[in-house]
Interface confidence: medium
C-alpha cells in the first residue's frame, strides 16, 4: 500500500452535469459524501465502489472496507467495525460473539488442537492484526464494558484492542 490515501482530497469538486451511474453511484454538485462501501474520487467527480480498488495502491481510501473484505476471507476471523480491526476468533473463544460461534464451537470440541493464539489468549493476550502501515492507536475499553459491536464480549484492561489510526 502506498500510504498516500485519497480520502484527504475533499476539495471543491464540481460535477457540472448529471450522468448515468448505475448501481447507486451518485452525481450532483459537490457531492462528497458517499454511500457505505463507496468513496468519493475527486478526479472522477463521483462516488466509486471500494471493491474496485482493494487491490490497488490507493487502498487506504477504503482501508476499513478493504481490510474487512480481506478479513472475511480468512477462516476463523471476522472484522469488527467498531474496533476497526480483524479479530481472530481463536483469541476470544469462550467469550466470543456470534460471528465466531462456528469457529469457536468446533475448536472447543477438540481442545487438544488449541491453536497458539488461543493458548496466548488464556494467558491474557489478544492477537492483533495490522495493515501494512504499522501505525496504531490504543483504544481503551473502560474496565470490562461490553463492546456494542461485540455482543457479550468483554475486554479486560489486559486485553486492550489496537485499532488502525
Amino acid at each position: 500500500m502506498s500510504g498516500l490515501g485519497r480520502s484527504r482530497r475533499g476539495g471543491r469538486s464540481r460535477v457540472d452535469q448529471e450522468e448515468r451511474f448505475p448501481q447507486g453511484l451518485w452525481t450532483g454538485v459537490a457531492m462528497r459524501s458517499c454511500p457505505e462501501e463507496q468513496y468519493w474520487d475527486p478526479l472522477l467527480g463521483t462516488c466509486m465502489s471500494c471493491k474496485t480498488i482493494c487491490n490497488h495502491q490507493s487502498q487506504r481510501t477504503c482501508a476499513a472496507f478493504c481490510r474487512s473484505l480481506s478479513c472475511r476471507k480468512e477462516q476463523g476471523k471476522f472484522y469488527d467495525h467498531l474496533l476497526r480491526d480483524c479479530i481472530s476468533c481463536a483469541s476470544i473463544c469462550g467469550q466470543h460473539p456470534k460471528q465466531c460461534a462456528y469457529f469457536c464451537e468446533n475448536k472447543l470440541r477438540s481442545p487438544v488442537n488449541l491453536p497458539p493464539e488461543l493458548r496466548r489468549q488464556r494467558s491474557g493476550e489478544v492477537e492483533n492484526n495490522s495493515d501494512n502501515s504499522g501505525r496504531y492507536q490504543g483504544l481503551e475499553h473502560r474496565g470490562s464494558e461490553a463492546s456494542p459491536a461485540l455482543p457479550g464480549l468483554k475486554l479486560s484492561a489486559d486485553q486492550v484492542a489496537l485499532v488502525y489510526s
Partner: antibody, heavy 118, light 107 residues
C-alpha cells in the same frame, strides 16, 4: 504486461460519425476506469471523458457533451469512443488512457488519428 | 476547471545539461501532479505520479518536486532520448487538466 491497442486511422466526411476502439489486456478490465484524451495536430492534450467498464457509467467534459459517446464491451475488454456530427475541429489523434486510481493515467493506447475532410 | 500553466513552452539544451520545467496550478492540487513525456507520433508516457514518484521503468535522472500550486520536473543530465515534449497534469479535482506542454529541443 498492460497493453491498450487502438483501432486504425480513419478518414471521415463532415457530418459523419466515427467509432474508435481501445482493446485492453494484461489486467482486470473492469477494475480500472478508461479515459479518452484528444490531441489536435501540433497541440496539447485535452481530456474528453471516461467510462467505468464495470457498470458502464460515463462522465464527459462539458465541451464534449453531445459530441462523444463512450461504451464498453466486457466480453472483449474493449472500450469505444464514438464522435458524432464530425467537423474539421474533430481532426485529431484520440488516445485511450487507463486511470491508476491516484490521479494519473498510467498506460496509454498508441492513438488513433481521425481526419475529417470533405 | 483548474488551469495548468507550464513554463517555458520550449527550451534548447545539450546532452548532459540539467533541465528544469515548471508547472503552476491555478489552485491548490496537493501533490496530485503527474508528468508525461511525448515524442512525435507517439502516445504520452507517464514519467512521474504524485509529484515525485517515478513510474516503473523511468530512469532516476528524472525527479519531481513541489506541492500545492508550484511544481518542478528536473532532468539531472539530459540524454539523447529525453528530447521530447513534457506535459504536467493535475489529478486532484474533476475534471483532469493538462499543462500546455514544454518542448525540449537539441541546442
Amino acid at each position: 504486461q498492460v497493453q491498450l491497442v487502438q483501432s486504425g486511422a480513419e478518414v471521415k466526411k463532415p457530418g459523419a460519425s466515427v467509432k474508435v476502439s481501445c482493446k485492453a489486456s494484461g489486467y482486470t478490465f473492469t477494475n480500472y476506469v478508461m479515459h479518452w484524451v484528444k490531441q489536435k495536430p501540433g497541440q496539447g492534450l485535452e481530456w474528453m471523458g471516461y467510462i467505468l467498464p464495470y457498470n458502464d457509467g460515463t462522465k464527459y467534459a462539458q465541451k464534449f457533451q453531445g459530441k462523444v459517446t463512450m461504451t464498453s464491451d466486457k466480453s472483449t475488454s474493449t472500450v469505444y469512443m464514438e464522435l458524432s456530427s464530425l467537423t474539421s475541429e474533430d481532426t485529431a489523434v484520440y488516445y485511450c488512457a487507463r486511470y491508476d486510481w491516484e490521479g494519473s493515467f498510467d498506460y496509454w493506447g498508441q492513438g488513433t488519428l481521425v481526419t475529417v475532410s470533405s | 476547471d483548474i488551469q495548468m500553466t507550464q513554463s517555458p513552452s520550449s527550451l534548447s539544451a545539450s546532452v548532459g545539461d540539467r533541465v528544469t520545467i515548471t508547472c503552476r496550478a491555478s489552485q491548490d492540487i496537493s501533490n496530485y501532479l503527474s508528468w508525461y513525456q511525448q515524442k512525435p507520433g507517439k502516445a504520452p508516457k507517464l514519467l512521474m505520479r504524485y509529484t515525485s514518484r517515478l513510474h516503473s521503468g523511468v530512469p532516476s535522472r528524472f525527479s519531481g518536486s513541489g506541492s500545492g500550486t508550484d511544481f518542478t520536473l528536473t532532468i539531472s543530465s539530459l540524454e539523447q532520448e529525453d528530447f521530447a515534449t513534457y506535459y504536467c497534469q493535475q489529478g486532484n479535482l474533476f475534471p483532469p487538466t493538462f499543462g500546455g506542454g514544454t518542448k525540449v529541443e537539441i541546442k
